[in-house]
């Protein structure tokens, strides 16, 4: 028996990290969005629950509802409407699947200080929103548009087609959620509030996933979701725009597909309004490589939408898929006819281009072996946009102003030298035409959220810099986080390591290595996070990597689009070369080294171990999708084309799991799964098991009863965490 | 008074084209939309379509595309209603009426108010 | 398009007496209903708009309740003048429909 290695962090004025504090989320940090109503004022829900008013120019604040009006009816969520007469209190928040839930809405007339009686809302909706004017309210009920024109008057009804798990008016199917639009609604009202467009979801033909739901109850129930896999019928989607100052007057007037697009399978990719009378809908083939952009217009005489041929402007990858994770959306400019859009340049770099009449005779407004990742606002003579260019970390986030008033453009970083240290990772959450902005800065330092002058840039003031954080980890023993780069070959892959307290390079330490690798994610982030692998590091002396290999996000499409049609080939590759690099370090116990991950980590965790190198002694797969056959349609093929013989079958079935299970014998293994995963389907790892099974491999499991992909249930996420860390403990000869 | 004055009984053969007029007075005739319903003998209404005076915006029932035109004079504050491709059932009384609520505050329906007095059209051969 | 049932077709009814009519949508209508009444050889006159409201000028024996699917316009004690047929409309959805009337005759 090998004797057991027990860790102990040097110096005990401070205490090393504990589960516990992990799991109570003892060191978790706040951030502050203020909720922007107008150029200089927003709201922010206080830390009592009271919403509270600024105007940052007068300095004036005041609570506009009261904690008490949300607690009467225990609401959670709010809404001002744009009038600023009425707020939406959302209460019964019940989730759904990652972005959807439905809840109980109740409106409080804030003039009269009552809440609106007549007609009520019904219960539960699936959607609310106010228009950007007035106080109109659009809502899905039981997958039905409905309108009110005010919150005291009766609805009109805008659909009829609505029917559960087979037609969705204004709120996406399960597929369209999850992998298109990331949000719960399918319906965007045009900016005076006249026009509201929805998209209608037709799942009558898609097959269902079903899954028992053990609950409490004597039986179980059955869940069943239209969820198309890879190769499946697909959700049938059709775009529709109703004119609300008309509801009775005039139906819902289809918008047209462009041929190109109407001609084989589609989908509908996003919609962004123009004008009050111009709306842009984004279109992509059912093989991801060709988006379409189409720009519409109302016609009043024809009572219809209009989408001329040459304001059609096609995007298309010739080496991989069309996009990012998802095709990026027009950012248009004050004459409501040019654009500005992030897409691949000539050297496959994603920039922001400017689109005044076809894409052929884009102008690049950024270039370089960078990458653009956001446009965040046009206005009149500023174009603000966050890219990883700084110093050359594709993992660092800054957010930069081109000033497109003057010829040529000039460029300023904002962020870059404002907290170099402490901030390196931002977004920005502007006022409608910018004239201010909040800076939300996620680390690697201490997260801290600023107030600032849209035309000078000047910090006005620290909206949330998280002291009382600050104070709580002053006696923590935290791990030294480093984020370098290694080369091998002609290849660059960029590493986070997570280095024990007192970490001294000439002894030998375990290494864990989480991955997660899929195709346009970054796990090499210069974020600040006290997680799990914090905690190992703290307490344990484990040492943890990050590498984003191959397929891997904002390093250039060479990088990305390696892994095109061969998932699960060269993201396991990159891994085990890094691990290998981590050893000729000379810190890293080669007879204890683990890996871990979950989802596509958990895909990638599993292949790794199953690559037969001997580099693993253990890991750990959770949830992990085994065979992109079992996975949704649209991620699928993205990435991967479609399962049949013509197309990419034979890489579908070479690259699952369960095709490896032989090579398992050598490894410990532990799988886990949640019973009532919506997302990667449990069957991916009874798929799994089964095949260990008949291959006689023994193997560790554990399944989480009704738990989703998350498995985030307070009592589910300890148990897990805690099953995980002994599983580790064991494996590296840690004592208890 | 508010009322709307419709022209005259029309005979048409099948194939032929009719305009009914309906002339507003006693209100602000760009306020108001005005509506076609149509009612065979011895049958229900059928609603055929809407104008708005103030702006000649007009739309019409599905049943109704292609073969029906709402114009409007606003020297004369009236509307007229073609129907084009006369069948025989067509055959009916047409009514304009006008919409109670006003053009600019369409979405609240109040009913239609105010009723011409009707038009027979008869098409025979 | 929605479909408006009208019931019953006609009645027969004696001065004073109360008269009750449904109208039925093929689907919710929420409250975005309106009745007329139509004399032979005449226009139709509006009577109720918005389910319940009284048009103005209307007799206060007319009444109208309902809202969704089902509506009932009620004459609470019938009047000479009152025999003619009824008609609902709804203003729900695009395109706007009638209810195929209910008579109200002399018994």
């Known amino acids: 028996l090998r004797p057991s290695r027990v860790y102990k962090p040097e110096g005990n004025t401070k205490r090393a990290l504990t589960l516990k504090d992990i799991l109570n989320g003892t060191f978790s940090y706040k951030t502050y969005f203020p909720n922007w109503i107008s150029e200089q004022e927003y709201l922010h829900q206080s830390e009592d629950d009271n919403i509270v008013f600024y105007n940052i120019e007068t300095r004036e604040s005041y609570i506009i509802l009261s904690n008490s009006t949300m607690k009467s009816v225990n609401a959670t969520d709010y809404g001002l409407s744009p009038d600023r007469q009425f707020v939406y209190l959302e209460s019964d928040y019940s989730k759904l699947w990652r972005y959807s839930y439905t809840a109980t809405y109740y409106i409080y007339d804030l003039q009269n200080g009552e809440f609106v009686r007549g007609y009520e809302l019904p219960r539960p909706i699936q959607y609310l929103c106010w228009s950007p004017v007035g106080s109109k309210l659009a809502y899905v009920y039981q997958n039905n548009i409905y309108l009110k024109q005010r919150p005291g008057d009766p609805p009109f009804q805008i659909t009829y087609t609505g029917r559960e798990n087979r037609i969705f008016n204004g709120i996406p199917d399960w597929v369209y959620e999850e992998e298109m639009l990331a949000t719960k609604y399918a319906l965007w009202w045009s900016p005076d509030g006249k026009f509201l467009a929805y998209v209608e979801f037709n799942d009558s033909d898609i097959p269902i996933i079903a899954y028992s739901y053990y609950g409490d109850g004597q039986y179980p129930r059955t869940i069943n979701i239209p969820y198309p896999k890879a190769g499946a019928k697909n959700p049938v989607v059709r775009v529709f725009i109703v004119d609300t100052t008309y509801p009775h007057h005039v139906g819902p007037m289809e918008v047209p597909v462009p041929e190109m697009i109407a001609s084989s399978d589609y989908y509908f990719s996003w919609l962004t309004w123009v004008s009050s009378e111009r709306v842009c809908l984004q279109w992509l083939k059912r093989v991801q490589n060709v988006s379409v952009l189409s720009i519409c217009d109302f016609r009043e005489d024809w009572h219809a939408w209009e989408c001329p041929k040459n304001q059609e402007h096609v995007e298309e990858s010739r080496t991989g898929w069309a996009g990012g994770f998802f095709v990026s959306t027009p950012a248009f400019s004050q004459d409501a006819t040019s654009y500005y859009k992030i897409f691949s340049d000539k050297d496959g770099y994603k920039h922001i281009h400017y689109i005044k009449d076809t894409v052929e005779n884009a102008i690049q407004i950024t270039s370089g072996k960078w990458e653009a990742i956001y446009i965040f606002r046009v206005t009149q003579d500023s174009l603000f946009y966050s890219s990883n260019e700084f110093e050359g970390y594709p993992g660092r986030r800054n957010i930069y102003r081109i000033s497109i008033g003057n010829s040529p453009p000039s460029k300023k970083c904002v962020t870059c030298h404002l907290r170099k240290e402490r901030c390196q990772y931002y977004t920005a959450s502007f006022s409608y035409k910018a004239k201010y902005y909040a800076l939300v800065c996620y680390g690697p330092g201490l997260p801290i959220s600023t107030l600032h002058d849209g035309r000078t840039d000047q910090e006005i003031q620290v909206l949330e810099e998280n002291k009382e954080l600050e104070n709580s980890l002053r006696n923590i023993q935290l791990p030294k986080v480093e984020i370098k780069k290694l080369k091998d070959g002609g290849l660059t892959f960029w590493y986070k390591m997570i280095l024990p307290p007192q970490f001294d390079r000439s002894k030998k330490y375990p290494l864990l290595i989480q991955v997660y690798g899929g195709p346009c994610s970054q796990s090499v982030k210069s974020v600040f996070a006290v997680n799990w692998i914090t905690y190992l590091a703290s307490k344990e002396g484990i040492v943890i990597a990050l590498v984003d290999g191959r397929g891997t996000a904002f390093q250039g499409d060479k990088f990305l689009h390696a892994v095109y049609r061969k998932l699960g080939v060269y993201e396991v590759e990159d891994q085990l070369t890094a691990v290998r690099k981590f050893i000729e370090m000379g810190f890293i116990d080669e007879e204890r080294i683990a890996i871990w991950g979950w989802s596509y980590g958990g895909y990638v965790s599993s292949l790794a171990l199953a690559s037969g190198t001997g580099l693993f002694k253990c890991g750990i797969a959770v949830a992990p999708v085994s065979s992109w056959e079992y996975y949704a349609s649209i991620y699928s093929e993205r990435f991967m084309g479609l399962p049949t013989k013509d197309d990419n079958l034979e890489h579908y079935k070479n690259s699952t799991v369960m095709a490896r299970a032989e090579y398992f014998r050598n490894v410990d293994y532990l799988l886990i799964h949640g019973t009532a995963d919506d997302n990667v389907h449990f069957q991916n790892s009874a798929q799994i098991a089964k095949a260990l099974v008949n291959a006689q491999v023994d193997f560790q499991a554990m399944w989480y009863s009704d738990q989703n992909h998350g498995i985030s249930s307070g009592r589910s996420q300890n148990h897990l965490y805690t099953h995980m860390t002994h599983f580790l403990k064991q494996c590296f000869s840690l004592s208890d | 008074q508010v009322q709307l004055q419709q022209s005259g009984v029309e005979v048409k053969k099948p194939g032929a084209s009719v305009t009914v007029s309906c002339r507003a007075s006693g209100y602000s005739f760009a306020d108001h939309f005005i509506h076609w319903v149509r009612q065979a003998p011895g049958q229900g209404f059928q609603w055929m379509g809407w104008i708005n005076p103030n702006r000649g915006v007009t739309h019409h029932a599905q049943d109704f595309q292609g073969r029906v035109a709402m114009t409007r004079d606003m020297s004369t504050d009236t509307v007229y209603m073609e129907l084009t491709s006369l069948r025989s059932d067509d055959t009916a009384v047409y009514y304009c009426a006008r919409d109670a609520s006003l053009t600019a505050r369409p979405y609240y329906f109040y009913g239609f108010d105010v009723w011409g007095q009707g038009t027979l059209v008869t098409v025979s051969s | 398009e929605i479909v408006l049932t009208q019931s019953p077709s006609s009645v027969s009814a004696s001065v004073g007496d109360r008269v009750t009519i449904t109208c039925r949508a093929s689907?919710?209508?929420?409250?975005?209903l309106a009745w007329y009444q139509q004399k032979p050889g005449k226009a139709p006159k509006l009577l109720i708009y918005?389910?319940?409201s009284l048009q103005s000028g209307v007799p206060s024996r007319f009444s109208g309740s309902g809202s969704g699917t089902d509506f009932t316009l009620t004459i609470s004690s019938l009047q000479p003048e009152d025999f003619a047929t009824y008609y609902c409309q709804q203003a729900n959805s695009f395109p706007l429909t009638f209810g195929g009337g209910t008579k109200v005759e002399i018994k």
């Open positions: 918005a389910a319940s």
């Open positions: 689907q919710g209508i929420s409250s975005w």
